[in-house]
Amino acid sequence: QSSERRVVAHMPGDIIIGALFSVHHQPTVDKVHERKCGAVREQYGIQRVEAMLHTLERINSDPTLLPNITLGCEIRDSCWHSAVALEQSIEFIRDSLISSEEEEGLVRCVDGSSSSFRSKKPIVGVIGPGSSSVAIQVQNLLQLFNIPQIAYSATSMDLSDKTLFKYFMRVVPSDAQQARAMVDIVKRYNWTYVSAVHTEGNYGESGMEAFKDMSAKEGICIAHSYKIYSNAGEQSFDKLLKKLTSHLPKARVVACFCEGMTVRGLLMAMRRLGLAGEFLLLGSDGWADRYDVTDGYQREAVGGITIKLQSPDVKWFDDYYLKLRPETNHRNPWFQEFWQHRFQCRLEGFPQENSKYNKTCNSSLTLKTHHVQDSKMGFVINAIYSMAYGLHNMQMSLCPGYAGLCDAMKPIDGRKLLESLMKTNFTGVSGDTILFDENGDSPGRYEIMNFKEMGKDYFDYINVGSWDNGELKMDDDEVWSKKSNIIRSVCSEPCEKGQIKVIRKGEVSCCWTCTPCKENEYVFDEYTCKACQLGSWPTDDLTGCDLIPVQYLRWGDPEP
């Protein structure tokens, strides 16, 4: 999929909502200039496309939500890449600017053909994209045209700044909260010396910055901090791993504020360099409980502790999604490509038949095989519902007593819609309350996951705790099985009695050498020895001085 031909999924309606999903992986470094995207993605791509289509169907059939108004959508592929997403957002804007009287918009239909839609409706709002860096670029464009944007997984703290990102909202919390959760885990296990890695880009950079700031306040030292692009080559990952190895055996814990594919790159490098079991990775929600991160590299990932946004599976989505087949799905223009990629077979005779596969797909194939629901599915659906409720509230206030779109609502004013969205308050897909604070952010609840070997060659993520509004709960026995197994990640061991810490010039405060005080000195504080005054001597525990008792010599006393 390259820049000259972009596929769009379109669903007709009275009001059109735009969406940006990473239907394909980002371009590899050598393909960035031509914006040629990678392989099709299931969880982050196809499932989210289907979630949009089916959620709109549910909204449209709900008589209490936007009665007499049909919501439609236009879904575009962001490829998890700023340049591609910007190009696609410009298309959204173009649609909004083209007047139906002046020009016809050309759209790529879900069946793959080109078709002219007279009076192409403008996009009233945009759902997504997933990546913070990409969301920022998209927001910079959308806000110029007063188009509200609701994100489902862009968690960067920068996006809370309403002076910069006025039309941005999200159904997920800011990363400041998960940075705090990560620091709380490090504190809990007394890891005072850790290495740090983050994905180059806004998500990783701002998240790691918060992690480092909070760590410093808690007396946690960062051995060294590294950054790397998610799509960096093998050599870059190998180089990074060698640097991390240089801090062993002291910095065993590696805090990774990373996108999932960065973690996968690290795991692959561990395999190449034979470093399985050398590190314990503490990962942010970019990793969470994704199997596409660990598949094939489970041994390297074992022990990993990850943060996952709390979002239970959505049953009704699976009921819908697992029935989909190439014969039953022609509104999703990427579905045939995905089916062939998923089952490594050729859909013989179908419009998007891929001849690179030798085997023909047979009728017994089903998505039920090895199905894993996108971990952020609930957020995607909540973002779509937020847009619907915002429009519903707007319609109620602008068109009282009127079912459908009244003249006062046409064309939809983005400023009024934003106001309405910010006041939205409804019960989300998992029964939780969805609301937005003054920054357009949602409250934060996280699950703590642990990647474990459950049996011979069987690995899985286990829920070992939670972090909710500043409170960390962990099942230590589940993580470590016994206290002695707790990994140590410290630069220097505590000094013995009568010793002080000497920090070498240029070293962090967690690394020291222990030096004993002189015979007449006591430990004044952990860094200083002080001599006892004349007539006094260090106490047995060397924490102070006792006066030397005066002994008078008598004529008959033996020689001392």
Epitope: D111, P326, G349, P351, N362
Partner: antibody, heavy 117, light 110 residues
Framework: SLEESGGGLVKPGGTLTLTCTAS?????????ICWVRQAPGKGLEWIGC??????AYNANWAKGRFAISQTSSTTVTLQMTSLPAADTATYFC?????????????WGPGTLVTVSS | AYDMTQTPASVEVAVGGTVTIKCQAS??????LAWYQQKPGQPPKLLIY???TLASGVSSRFKGSGSGTQFALTISDLECADAATYYC????????????FGGGTEVVVK
């Protein structure tokens, strides 16, 4: 082979259930079983299909009044409600077995349904 | 919605002649098209699937072609036994369909 049964005379507004029975094979999870009808002197009209035992799909015009279900490993039914005279036709069931797509390679002889008062 | 348009509705051809029936899909279906032959009082019989593949036991005088939205069935060296009604059917999708079959073409052999 396939054989349809349950056809006959029914009054307008009535309900009728047709059954498609397989002989020599049973409906597995990879079969498409479809219903097609043909009004006297007219062309073939696709009603809908069922894939496996649960997933049924109807033509746009057949949604609501026509329901396809698998009742056993060798029978599939077509339930028709609120029948108008225009539903008078020969009803065929047909099977697709093979790769993706649903070309119908095995047909039953058909059963005639007459809707008249 | 998917529907199929078949032309002509009826055609008369002499024995030994050639006839071409056309079928148009409203949206692209790749090569997922089948052709059936139906004689009075009988169920349809599959002739061609995947636009051009002959079903087993079908004479090579029947030839299917096309892809995307435009398809054709050509019968050469017509025989009296070929007198029948021929239908095309899109065999790609089972959702959002008005009719999977074309309207039919009656072939009369003189």
């Amino acid at each position: 082979s396939l054989e349809e049964s349950g056809g006959g005379l029914v009054k307008p507004g009535g309900t009728l259930t047709l059954t498609c029975t397989a002989s020599g094979f049973s409906f597995s999870s990879s079969y498409w079983i479809c219903w097609v009808r043909q009004a006297p002197g007219k062309g073939l009209e696709w009603i809908g299909c069922i894939y496996g035992s649960t997933d049924a799909y109807n033509a746009n015009w057949a949604k609501g009044r026509f329901a396809i279900s698998q009742t056993s490993s060798t029978t599939v039914t077509l339930q028709m409600t609120s029948l108008p005279a225009a539903d008078t036709a020969t009803y065929f069931c047909a099977r697709h077995d093979g790769d993706i797509g649903w070309t119908l390679d095995l047909w039953g002889p058909g059963t005639l349904v007459t809707v008249s008062s | 919605a998917y529907d199929m348009t078949q032309t002509p509705a009826s055609v008369e051809v002499a024995v030994g002649g050639t006839v071409t029936i056309k079928c148009q899909a409203s949206l692209t279906i790749g090569t997922r098209l089948a052709w059936y032959q139906q004689k009075p009082g009988q169920p349809p019989k599959l002739l061609i699937y995947k636009a051009s593949t002959l079903a087993s036991g079908v004479s090579s005088r029947f030839k299917g072609s096309g892809s995307g939205t435009q398809f054709a069935l050509t019968i050469s060296d017509l025989e009296c036994a070929d007198a029948a009604t021929y239908y095309c059917q899109q065999a790609a999708y089972v959702t959002d369909i008005d009719n999977a079959f074309g309207g039919g073409t009656e072939v009369v052999v003189k």
